[in-house]
């Protein structure tokens, strides 16, 4: 039961995380105008990965897409790439994990296959989350660098009568959405990997025959020394007479006409 819960929770957490990564990638507020020097501005600027926007105090908002590809900063291109890779990996991971879920039965899929799929999706979620966190962090670093550069420019060359106010940008909402979403995807991936360990079928249990030797009540089980000595992975208290030795958590029922893919 714990394995199913861990797997299911990992899936849900990753799903929320990937939805967040998609939302962050599409959001326009990656960087927003710093209002520290002018809290009563009548023009508010904010920028995303794909377009920059200006919201006027009058209520009108105008957004312009970055129609050039070569003219964009390499860092912005890198952030875009990281976010897209994160989304693609996450989407594939979600697809794989759907089929890996214990509660969904596809034909007579082996537990080992489900375990492998769970592990694969888990790794994909971890990489996806790391991509998102890396992308957002690279952008944040770029903002911090530009912020201090523009701050330095603000206080130099002010000998003239006319002031030229340079627009400074600070962290936008999308950065926080991205960090949280990346973290959730990462956590979901870790949970899937943990669930995979519980899903992995233990050594094949053959039909056991009990031989009652005089003096000692030892159950003989074909399959080597490990079977009865407490070493190896078979340390759970299991019934050894059912052929398909599984804990309650691992009961596999075969598809009936009421099962849906």
């Amino acid at each position: 039961m714990a394995v199913t819960a861990c797997q299911g929770l990992g899936f849900v957490v990753s799903l929320i995380g990937i939805a967040g990564i998609i939302a962050a990638t599409c959001m326009d507020q990656w960087s927003t105008q710093d209002l520290y020097n002018n809290p009563v501005t009548a023009v508010f600027n904010y920028q995303g990965l794909w377009r920059s926007c200006v919201r006027e105090s009058s209520g009108f908002t105008e957004c312009r897409g970055y129609f050039t590809l070569l003219g964009l900063p390499a860092m912005l291109q890198a952030v875009r790439a990281l976010m897209i890779v994160g989304i693609v990996l996450g989407a594939i991971g979600l697809l794989v994990s759907i089929f890996a879920l214990k509660c969904i039965r596809i034909g007579s899929m082996e537990d080992s296959a489900k375990a492998n799929m769970t592990l694969t999706s888990g790794i994909m979620f971890i990489v996806s989350g790391l991509c998102a966190i890396a992308g957002v962090s690279v952008f944040a670093n770029m903002l911090v660098t530009n912020f201090w550069m523009s701050t330095a420019n603000m206080y130099t060359g002010m000998g003239g009568m006319v002031q030229t106010v340079q627009t400074r940008y600070t962290f936008g909402a999308a950065l926080f959405v991205g960090w949280v979403a990346g973290g959730l995807t990462l956590i979901g991936g870790v949970m899937m990997c943990i669930a995979c360990r519980g899903l992995a079928p233990e050594e094949t249990n053959y039909k056991a025959v009990s031989y009652h030797a005089s003096g000692h009540s030892v159950a003989y089980k074909p399959g080597g020394f490990k079977a009865s000595t407490g070493f190896g992975s078979n340390t759970k208290n299991k019934k050894i007479y059912d052929g398909g030795a599984r804990t309650e958590d691992e009961v596999q029922s075969y598809p009936s006409k009421h099962d849906y893919v």
Epitope: V40, S58, F60, E62, Q163, V165
Partner: antibody, heavy 118, light 113 residues
């Protein structure tokens, strides 16, 4: 057709109060920011106050801050300017204006005259 | 606060003449986000409310004759009337739209010779 009609002007004693109204029609009032702009006799234009569509953002000129209050009633399409502690320098023609693209005023009312005198 | 300086304070012209008036701000009105200058020009005839002519320093409001042209960037702006008509006799105001307070210039009065 967009129409803005101001009312409520008149003669007021110094230190007195007055409430100006601006009835709007011909556009979706709640989606536009609105302003009050005044013009003293034989003088230039002076911006007084601003309120955005949902009243979440309000700004005042330093000369009226603390004395004037801008508000709006979106269901009734009316803009208000509550004026208190009036001074002789508040004597002017008061216009309400609609805020437009480029942070400009595209439509103005005909104005209402306020005279502060003893 | 941004200070707006309009010059000249008055202009005496003859019909058909080309007129230019200036508006200077103490701070740049250029917004890098959309590459626009937040300066507006109005025309006010006697006993009438002001009328919007040009916004974003150079964008003509619909219905405004094309003899009115706005230009300039940053801190220096100009309103040009290519061929003055008698109906153009009025006071012209510039206004900042970049930051509060939304200051107006003192105005340029256009008079007929």
């Amino acid at each position: 057709d967009v129409q803005l009609v101001e009312s409520g002007g008149g003669l007021v004693q110094p230190g007195g109060s007055r409430k100006l109204s601006c009835a709007a029609s011909g556009f979706t009032f709640s989606t536009f920011g609105m302003h009050w702009v005044r013009q003293a006799p034989e003088k230039g234009l002076e911006w007084v106050a601003f309120i955005n569509g949902d009243s979440s953002s309000i700004y005042y000129a330093d000369t009226v801050k603390g004395r004037f209050t801008i508000s709006r009633d979106n269901p009734k399409n009316i803009l208000f300017l509550q004026m208190t502690s009036l001074r002789s320098e508040d004597t002017a023609m008061y216009y309400c204006a609609r805020f437009a693209r480029g942070n400009s005023f595209d439509y103005w009312g005909q104005g209402t005259t306020l005279t502060v005198s003893s | 606060d941004i200070v707006m300086t309009q010059s000249p304070s008055s202009l005496t012209v003859t019909a058909g003449e080309k007129v230019t008036m200036s508006c200077k701000s103490s701070q740049s009105l250029f917004n890098s986000g959309n590459q626009k200058n937040y300066l507006t020009w109005y025309q006010q005839k006697p006993w009438q409310p002001p009328k919007l002519l040009i916004y974003w320093a150079s964008t003509r409001e619909s219905g405004v004759p094309d003899r009115f042209t706005g230009s300039g960037s940053g801190t220096d702006f100009t309103l040009t009337i290519t061929s003055v008509q008698t109906e153009d006799l009025a006071v012209y105001y510039c206004q900042i739209g970049y930051t509060y307070p939304l200051t107006f210039g003192a105005g340029t009065k256009l008079e007929l010779k």
